[in-house]
Amino acid sequence: KEEQTTFRDCAEIFKSGLTTSGIYTLTFPNSTEEIKAYCDMDVGGGGWTVIQHREDGSVDFQRTWKEYKEGFGSPLGEYWLGNEFVSQLTGQHRYVLKIQLKDWEGNEAHSLYDHFYLAGEESNYRIHLTGLTGTAGKISSISQPGSDFSTKDSDNDKCICKCSQMLSGGWWFDACGPSNLNGQYYPQKQNTNKFNGIKWYYWKGSGYSLKATTMMIRPADF
């Protein structure tokens, strides 16, 4: 049997026998274009493609549409994998989305959606989510039905206020919605009463800015 040399996601890498967490090269579906991603091979059975990570505020997340489309940051630290890759990937097969959150008091929580995909750029990478379970709130902190993605230079939200500018970062803002994991990073003791922080309302409330977040995807049939 010929060994697979290109991988669409971290689940394929895991299944090939490479089961150590770290940076791997993935290939766009139906293309030779490559992208580097962090693969979490430890959490919940492994095979997770990390699409977003925040941990220390070292990377500026107030970026342009193009940067959110193509990705930015470092897969070893804070980064955004890229809307285009995620859209293409999740348009091919059914994926689940796991969101892991940490607060400043040492607590952790997660939200798991049993079906996640991003529409194409022509639909502003609108998010689609169903089937929420987990410990980070019984109600989805990503507005349902899903919103279009907005950035500081591409305002697709439902507010006259330009949510991305007011709340910082690119996100699926509604008007402006109960979450924003790409908001301004605030250190401990400065992380409360912040409209524009890293927010997951149905876990920590409106003004609380989180310490760390990870968004990761995996095929539903893994």
Epitope: C163, G177, F195, S206
Partner: antibody, heavy 123, light 112 residues
Framework: QVQLVQSGAEVKKPGSSVKVSCKAS????????ISWVRQAPGQGLEWMGR????????NYAQKFQGRVTITADKSTSTAYMELSSLRSEDTAVYYC????????????????WGQGTTVTVSS | DIVMTQSPLSLPVTPGEPASISCRSS???????????LDWYLQKPGQSPQLLIY???NRASGVPDRFSGSGSGTDFTLKISRVEAEDVGVYYC?????????FGGGTKVEIK
């Protein structure tokens, strides 16, 4: 386009209560804080309180605490403001208003207003 | 509570001339996101208030560009570059940083 339509004018006796309704149409209701603002004849605008329908939580200006109750019915997208122990000084136009962003994003200034409900308190 | 103070109380204006209204808050309305949570409203005679300027300096939809908002922290100004007859009414500033939301006392703009 969101619209807020309020109930009609009321004439009330001192000591009684009044309940004014505000029906939202043409947009999301539950996640926006509906505020009530009043204006006595020839006077300025005064914020009374607000409700967040999705949470069922209301908060009030200190001045009206204990005398005003703001509620909401999500099924009909209607907010209500009830003011009790009415006195002549409560004669005013009462407005409901909706902010330009949802409650998750801050208290918010108002970009959609009802047409106003005149409440006259007279013996 | 944040106290909002407006001046002048009354402003007689000549059509075509500029006009300026001042608003002061008892504490800063500048949030850490860089926005000032200060709105301006116009209430025309017999009408509900309408939003003119939001978050300090942003014109609401359909508001003519002769209206502009400026200022930061505790001192804010609404300017009308060339007053028109339809601009008459009472102008209010309002802080939207925290509840209770509080309004300035209003400035009545009338044609001379």
């Amino acid at each position: 386009q969101v619209q807020l339509v309020q109930s009609g004018a009321e004439v009330k006796k001192p000591g009684s209560s009044v309940k004014v309704s505000c029906k939202a149409s043409g947009g999301t209701f539950s996640s926006y804080a509906i505020s009530w603002v009043r204006q006595a004849p020839g006077q300025g605008l005064e914020w009374m309180g607000r409700i967040i329908p999705i949470l069922g939580i209301a908060n009030y200006a200190q001045k009206f605490q204990g005398r005003v109750t703001i509620t909401a019915d999500k099924s009909t997208s209607t907010a209500y403001m009830e003011l009790s122990s009415l006195r002549s000084e409560d004669t005013a136009v009462y407005y409901c208003a909706r902010p330009y962003y949802d409650f998750w994003s801050g208290p918010g200034g108002m970009d959609v207003w009802g047409q106003g409900t005149t409440v006259t308190v007279s013996s | 509570d944040i106290v909002m103070t407006q001046s002048p109380l009354s402003l007689p204006v000549t059509p075509g001339e500029p006009a300026s209204i001042s608003c002061r808050s008892s504490q800063s309305l500048l949030h850490s996101n860089g926005y000032n949570y200060l709105d301006w409203y116009l209430q025309k005679p017999g009408q509900s208030p309408q939003l003119l300027i939001y978050l300090g300096s942003n014109r609401a939809s359909g508001v003519p560009d002769r209206f502009s908002g400026s200022g930061s922290g505790t001192d804010f100004t609404l300017k009308i570059s060339r007053v028109e007859a339809e601009d008459v009414g009472v102008y209010y500033c309002m802080q939207a940083l925290q509840t209770p939301l509080t309004f300035g006392g209003g400035t009545k703009v009338e044609i001379k």
